[in-house]
Interface confidence: low
């Protein structure tokens, strides 16, 4: 017989010959990192037709990593569902937890032994510190110092004292979110007051008011004989002003040479209308999230986060 | 489901050595470390060692280092403890139970045997 | 190694009322944000079963009436309300490190 075969479990013991006489037993060991589980047989015998005995590595089984328990509050999920040394272990935290720790553990051979390549992370709660005040308002639940995932706070607006109301710009909710960042930039409170807004050769047709505050919408038609540049619908953003601008009607002109077109008694140029949150002018205010302070709790990353108008 | 079964009683005389066993079922053997915990009459509970069936790695108290030997047989899923050289202080109840593995801590012991009576006597 | 201390030794509770068994150990027992503590019972002729584990968290089948708290190295077990099935020994138990400790027990009696 030639050579005896190979395996990726087992290995010859001793030193293999280049030929092999017939009767002729060689045996196997497992590899470094697998172990022997009887009673499958490692040897084999150069048969009277020149060849090895069938056998294999069945035998030898990979070492495994210590069992590794779900930690509290999540869930350790080993890659191809074992412990063999070679796979990895990944670690999820449920919802309203975060990891702290590796993410990912792998099973390494250590001389002969099978072990995780280090300390199995823990699933913490997210915890928020308390959400930012703001100018000229207030959020619910001020008094409390900690708040838990999906804890929400809601912002008002303090009575003004002129004749005109605080606005407030953004969503009044926000909740504890993920990496106990919050979901969201407070929202602000300020006077938001619109120009009364002057089309002349058109008219108001919704939206009438004496004083226009934050997100009043107000829609226009032109006279006869004269065709809307701009948007009929405008509203008072936060900046205190109308967005799209105010439109103009401007004359209706006969073509020289063409015959003039059969015109309605207002038109737009505008193809279509921008609704009141689609658009923005002015410079957006910035944020930077509340950092998380409380020991044993890693720092958000500390990015500036747009408000929402 | 989970099991861990023990003989009930071993008679033994003193300094002869006993072997005492505990044979798994109803879950991986090799996963899970066996612990053996002894109790004499009308006393409390003594940590012996444990033993992970996977490598056979072992810990031992150091009060039974020179008493106890922990083994395992994975092919038939059987832990043993060898006690030598036994003296009537040796008699008592000898638990072996399962416990799980975090880290570098453990677990509770969360299924126990029956538990075998050893009785030192001549 | 750590040193479990438990109190008190034994303790009659009448029943429907509140038992509370007390355990302290040498060090903390806290590893990886968890309390590595169990609570265990055990009856006449029987091997301990497990109530808590970690502390705070029931073993399999333990009734809600059985409830675990503590954390760093001050434990106790509390069992509320009292039944008839309650009297046994229970013990508390350190696996943070080898060699496991447990404490001395407690005898829990019918008043």
């Known amino acids: 017989c030639e050579e005896p075969p190979t395996f990726e479990a087992m290995e010859l013991i001793g030193k293999p010959k280049p030929y092999y006489e017939i009767g002729e037993r060689v045996d196997y060991k497992c590899k470094k990192g697998y172990f022997y589980i009887p009673p499958l047989a490692t040897h084999t015998i150069c048969d009277r037709n020149h060849t090895w005995l069938p056998v294999s590595d069945d035998a030898c089984y990979r070492e495994t990593c210590p069992y590794i328990r779900d930690p509290l509050n999540g869930q350790a999920v080993p890659a191809n569902g074992t412990y063999e040394f070679g796979y990895q272990m990944h670690f999820i935290c449920n919802e309203g937890y975060y990891l702290i720790g590796e993410e990912i553990l792998y099973c390494e051979l250590k001389g002969s032994v099978a072990i995780w390549s280090g300390k199995p992370p823990i699933c913490e709660k997210v915890l928020c510190t308390p959400p930012p005040k703001i100018k000229n308002g207030k959020h619910t639940f001020s008094e409390v110092e900690v708040f838990e995932y999906l804890d929400a706070v809601t912002y008002s607006c303090d009575p003004a004292p002129g004749p005109d109301p605080f606005s407030l710009i953004g969503e009044s909710t926000i909740y504890c979110g993920d990496n106990s960042v919050w979901s969201r930039a407070a929202p602000e409170c300020k006077v938001v007051k619109c120009r009364f807004p002057v089309v002349e050769n058109g008219k108001q047709i919704s939206g009438f008011g004496k004083k226009f505050y934050y997100k009043a919408t107000v829609m226009f038609e032109c006279d006869k004989g004269f065709y809307l540049d701009g948007s009929d619908t405008i509203v008072c953003d936060s900046n205190s002003t109308w967005d799209p601008p105010v439109p103009k009607c401007l004359k209706v002109l006969p073509p020289s040479s063409t015959k003039p077109p059969a015109l309605s008694h207002s038109v737009s140029t505008s193809s279509t209308t921008k609704s009141p949150a689609s658009s923005a002018s002015g410079p957006r205010p910035t944020y930077k999230p509340p950092v998380s302070n409380y020991p044993g709790y890693p720092k958000p990353e500390e990015g500036i986060l747009d408000s929402l108008d | 489901q989970v099991q861990l079964q023990q003989p009930g009683a071993e008679l033994v005389r003193p300094g002869a050595s006993v072997k005492l066993s505990c044979k798994a079922s109803g879950y991986t053997f090799t996963a899970f470390w066996i612990n053996w915990v002894k109790q004499r009459p009308g006393q409390g509970l003594e940590w012996i060692g444990n033993i992970y069936p996977s490598d056979s790695y072992t810990n031992y108290n150091q009060n039974f280092k020179d008493k106890a030997t922990l083994t395992v047989d994975k092919s038939s899923s059987t832990a043993y403890m060898q006690l030598s050289s036994p003296t009537s202080e040796d008699s008592a109840v000898y638990y072996c139970?399962?416990?799980?593995?975090?880290?570098?801590?453990?677990?509770?012991?969360?299924?126990w045997g029956q538990g075998t009576s050893v009785t030192v006597s001549s | 190694d750590i040193v479990v201390t438990q109190s008190p030794a034994s303790l009659a509770v009448s029943l429907g009322q509140r038992a509370t068994i007390s355990c302290r150990a040498s060090?903390?027992?806290?590893?990886?944000?968890?309390?590595?503590m169990n609570w265990f019972q055990q009856k006449p002729g029987q091997p301990p079963k497990l109530l808590i584990y970690?502390?705070?968290n029931q073993g399999s089948g333990v009734p809600a009436r059985f409830s675990g708290s503590g954390s760093g190295s001050d434990f106790s077990l509390n069992i509320h309300p009292m039944e008839e099935d309650d009297p046994a020994m229970y013990f508390c138990?350190?696996?943070?490190?080898?060699?496991?400790?447990f404490g001395s027990g407690t005898k829990l009696e019918i008043k």
């Open positions: 138990q350190q696996s943070k490190e080898v060699p496991f400790t």
């Open positions: 060090e903390s027992v806290d590893n990886y944000g968890i309390s590595f």
């Open positions: 970690a502390a705070s």
């Open positions: 139970a399962r416990s799980d593995y975090y880290g570098s801590s453990y677990y509770a012991l969360d299924y």
